[in-house]
Structures are given as C-alpha cells and as structure tokens.
C-alpha cells in the first residue's frame, strides 16, 4: 500500500473534494486547472494529457456552474467533426444540446470556452490559454 | 466519534482538498462559494456567517490565484475605517500593501472584488453578488 500515505476522518457537516493533482481547483469532485501560457489546441491537449487530464469537458451546467464566472476564453476539449458536422469531446461523446451557445467567431474546428457557457469556434492553430480537467472516480 | 463517517486513503501523487461545506470550491485548502443573489454588504456578510464562513479575504496572490480569472465584481470582506483611513478585513487585519489595486468607483466604505486583484470601492448599501470564504485549519 505504498502509494497511500494519509488516513483522514471527514465530518458529516463538511466534505473533502478530490483527489486532484496538487494545487488544482476541486469542485463537485471534478478537478480543474487554468493555464496561463498560450498554446494551440493540439499543444494544449498534449499538456493536459501529460498531467493525466484532458481539456475541459462541459457536461452539466449544474455540476459545473463555477464555469459561468470564468473570464476571457480558453481552449476546451471540443472539436468539430467535418464528416458529419457534429461537435464532439475528446472522449468521443457528442456535445449535448443546450449546454453551450456556439458562436462562430472564426473559421475553425476547435472551440474555446467563454464565460456563461459559450463556445467560440476558432482555428485550432491559434494560441490561447486553456483549461485542463480531471474527473474523479 | 459520531460526527465522522468516512475514512479515505489518499494517493501520494494526488491530494484531497478541504474539508469544505458541500459543493463549495476548494483550492489550496481554502473553500470558496460565489453567490448569485444580490445583497448589500451587511446582508452578504450575514449570509456568509450563517454558513460558518466570512466574506472573501484576499491574503495571497499566489495561494488565491484562481481569483484572477473571476469575471464581474462581488462583495468581499474589506471595509474602510474612516477614523484612521485604513482598509481592514472582517477579522480586523489590515489590508496588506500591493495585494489589491483599490479603485474608487463610488463613495463608500465597502469594497467589491474584481478580477485581477482589484478592489472597487462602493456604497455598502448597494446590492451585489458576493463571495464567501472558509479557511481550512
């Protein structure tokens, strides 16, 4: 059991969140990190993967309501599939209707997350900040 | 030990955050919650206190760097003391220099937190959204 080093007792009135990578944001048992450096979509994806995470997936306005307060715009894990015209997440799931307001800001097949649950379509090669996410089991 | 109901084992590579009130944001072992309803400063303070928390206290740009990404503005626990002209937090501590850029938006003795570590002076009776914070032990 060498990977484990702590036993904690949790009060019923409060709860622990996670586990998450050190110094990530934890909310409703999902882990988030905002990265300041600008990278294109592919580099952003690689950065998240290197930290055992993925680019942001928006799956619930309720469970992810902290996102409505995020300023600016950041790469998320949403990409356009030209063959069938759909938008899908890195894990292959299709974007659920009414989750994001998609705005065609530019010609492109990648999407930026913008506050209040908006998705800005942008060229995948354009450098931007990005959000990584890790879902806890 | 009836208040405690869970024992969890934490991998060395990751960590739990908290404990926090249920569904609050946890970051670097501080707990935050953003409240949508607009209240004046006093009502906002009372709301936080009723949840065993206080209005946001900004004490470290490093430990609270998630705040730089917050859009809009929200009541925090900073008030002006007319007798000596200082700004202090609810716990009586004085605002540290260089932590916040104070901007005199209005005549008032209370302050709103705005993104990128700015404090907007505002009349304490003005309704605004607010941020509660609970520091973990």
């Amino acid at each position: 059991n060498s990977l484990f080093n702590q036993e904690v007792q949790i009060p019923l009135t409060e709860s622990y969140c996670g586990p998450c990578p050190k110094n990530w944001i934890c909310y409703k048992n999902n882990c988030y990190q905002f990265f300041d450096e600008s990278k294109n979509w592919y580099e952003s994806q690689a950065s998240c993967m290197s930290q055992n995470a993925s680019l942001l997936k928006v799956y619930s306005k309720e469970d992810q309501d902290l996102l409505k307060l995020v300023k600016s715009y950041h790469w998320m894990g949403l990409v356009h599939i030209p063959t069938n015209g759909s938008w899908q997440w890195e894990d292959g799931s299709i974007l659920s209707p009414n989750l994001l307001t998609i705005i065609e800001m530019q010609k492109g097949d990648c999407a930026l997350y913008a506050s209040s649950f908006k998705g800005y379509i942008e060229n995948c090669s354009t450098p931007n900040t990005y959000i990584c996410m890790q879902r806890t089991v | 030990n009836s208040l405690f109901n869970q024992e969890v084992q934490i991998p060395l590579t990751e960590s739990y955050c908290g404990p926090c009130p249920k569904n609050w944001i946890c970051y670097k072992n501080n707990c935050y919650q953003f409240f949508d309803e607009s209240k004046n400063w006093y009502e906002s303070q009372a709301s936080c206190m009723s949840q065993n928390a206080s209005l946001l206290k900004v004490y470290s740009k490093e430990d609270q760097d998630l705040l730089k990404l917050v859009k809009s503005y929200h009541w925090m626990g900073l008030v002006h003391i007319p007798t000596n002209g200082s700004w202090q937090w609810e716990d009586g501590s004085i605002l540290s220099p260089n932590l916040l850029t104070i901007i005199e938006m209005q005549k008032g003795d209370c302050a709103l937190y705005a993104s990128s570590f700015k404090g907007y002076i505002e009349n304490c009776s003005t309704p605004n959204t607010y941020i509660c914070m609970q520091r973990t032990v």
């Epitope: 300023k71 705005i103 379509i121 354009t126 | 990128s116 700015k118």
Partner: antibody
C-alpha cells in the same frame, strides 16, 4: 454604459513625441484587450496597436513598430499610446477601442486628432 | 502584411438590397468583421465572425464568406444606412495584427 474618452492629441513637429490617453468606464477594464486605430483625414481606418487585458502582450502594425508603445494602467482604467519620432504620415484621428474578441472591436471612443507638421 | 480590397463606392435604392464585398487572401482563413462609419463619428461594429450581430444592430445586416471574399448584405436599405463601410480581418502573416479594407461609401438613393 461603456465609455471611452481619448485625450492628448494636438499639433507636434516631425520627430516629436506625444502621449495619448484613453479613459475607460462602464466595464471591467482589465478583462479586455484594447486597441488603437487611426484614420488620416479623408482616408480609411488603419489598425495601429493592441494590448492584452493584463498588459503582458503588445502588438503593433509594421508602420509604427519601434516608434509607438502601447500600455495600460488597470488601476486607473486608462489606455496609453506613446508616440515617438512622429512623421507627417502619422497625422490622423486616433481612436481607442475595446475588443469584443481578438480583432473584433465593439466599442470605440470619439477620437483625438494628432497633427504632425512643421 | 495582407491587403483587403473594397469597391470605393456603391449605391442602392431605398428599400432595396445591396451587397458590399471585400477581397483578400487572409479571408480564405479568417472571417471578416464589418464596421459602419458615419461622417464625424466613430466606427460601429455591425458584423463579426461568420454572421454575428452585436446587440442593437438591425437584422437587415448580414455577413457571408466564400473563398477569398467576404460580403456584407443590407436587405431593405434605409436612409440611415448611408455611411462608409470597412471590412477588417486578421493578417494572414501574423494573427496578432489586423488589417482594414479601404472602405466602401454606400449611398442610399
């Protein structure tokens, strides 16, 4: 209500310097990139420079690179354009603009006239 | 840097439809935005992205794009639409720079 108010324009001799200011209100200034755009008398619009919300990234048109410097003071909600080594062809109305998204500018000031002449 | 080319002047009868075009290599990669400018006034953003209108812009204004050409269409032109119209795009050589077209003077007859 978003408002942008430019100032600092005037008459300057070739080779001289001028500093333009743009006072912003009605929005969270530090959350938005800002730009300067100019318009020579009777001519079209020309993008001059842009700066990120934090002030950490700046961009310039080739025509002004090395001579103009864009900056901002988020504590004062103010955008600046320092113009050095001015030339006759820099004569224009200079507008500051708030960026909606990258190159899209959704609010503009009324402009300040810079005249470079001996 | 890139160049965007616009017709210097276009006219339209009141209530009719007019299309203002903008050509340039950068438009193969990027959408244009369109600005309206009336004499003595600051420019106003009327279209951005694929076909997005800021709040307050009437729905008679629309944008489209094909190949290296961007178009601004005014369906049912009004007298108050008489103005100069400028297209704008990212520079194809540097995404952090942007370029304006020379402008089109629209006259409503």
């Amino acid at each position: 209500e978003v408002q942008l108010l430019e100032s600092g324009g005037g008459l300057v001799q070739p080779g001289g310097s001028l500093r333009l200011s743009c006072a912003a209100s009605g929005f969270t200034f530090s959350s938005y990139a800002m730009s300067w755009v100019r318009q020579a008398p009777g001519k079209g619009l020309e993008w001059v420079s842009a700066i990120s919300g934090s002030g950490g990234s700046t961009y310039y048109a080739d025509s002004v690179k090395g001579r103009f410097t864009i900056s901002r003071d988020n504590s004062k909600n103010t955008l600046y354009l320092q113009m050095n080594s001015l030339r006759a062809e820099d004569t224009a109305v200079y507008y500051c603009a708030k960026e909606l998204y990258r190159e899209y500018m959704d609010y503009w000031g009324q402009g300040t006239l810079v005249t470079v002449s001996s | 840097s890139s160049e965007l080319t616009q017709d210097p002047a276009v006219s339209v009868a009141l209530g009719q439809t007019v299309r203002i075009t903008c050509q340039g290599d950068s438009l193969r990669s990027y959408y244009a935005s369109w600005y309206q400018q009336k004499p003595g006034q600051a420019p106003v953003l009327v279209i951005y992205g694929k076909n997005n209108r800021p709040s307050g812009i009437p729905d008679r204004f629309s944008g489209s794009s094909s190949g290296n050409t961007a178009s601004l269409t005014i369906t049912g032109a009004q007298a108050e639409d008489e103005a100069d119209y400028y297209c704008n795009s990212r520079d194809s050589f540097s995404i952090h720079q942007n370029v304006f077209g020379g402008g089109t003077k629209l006259t409503v007859l």
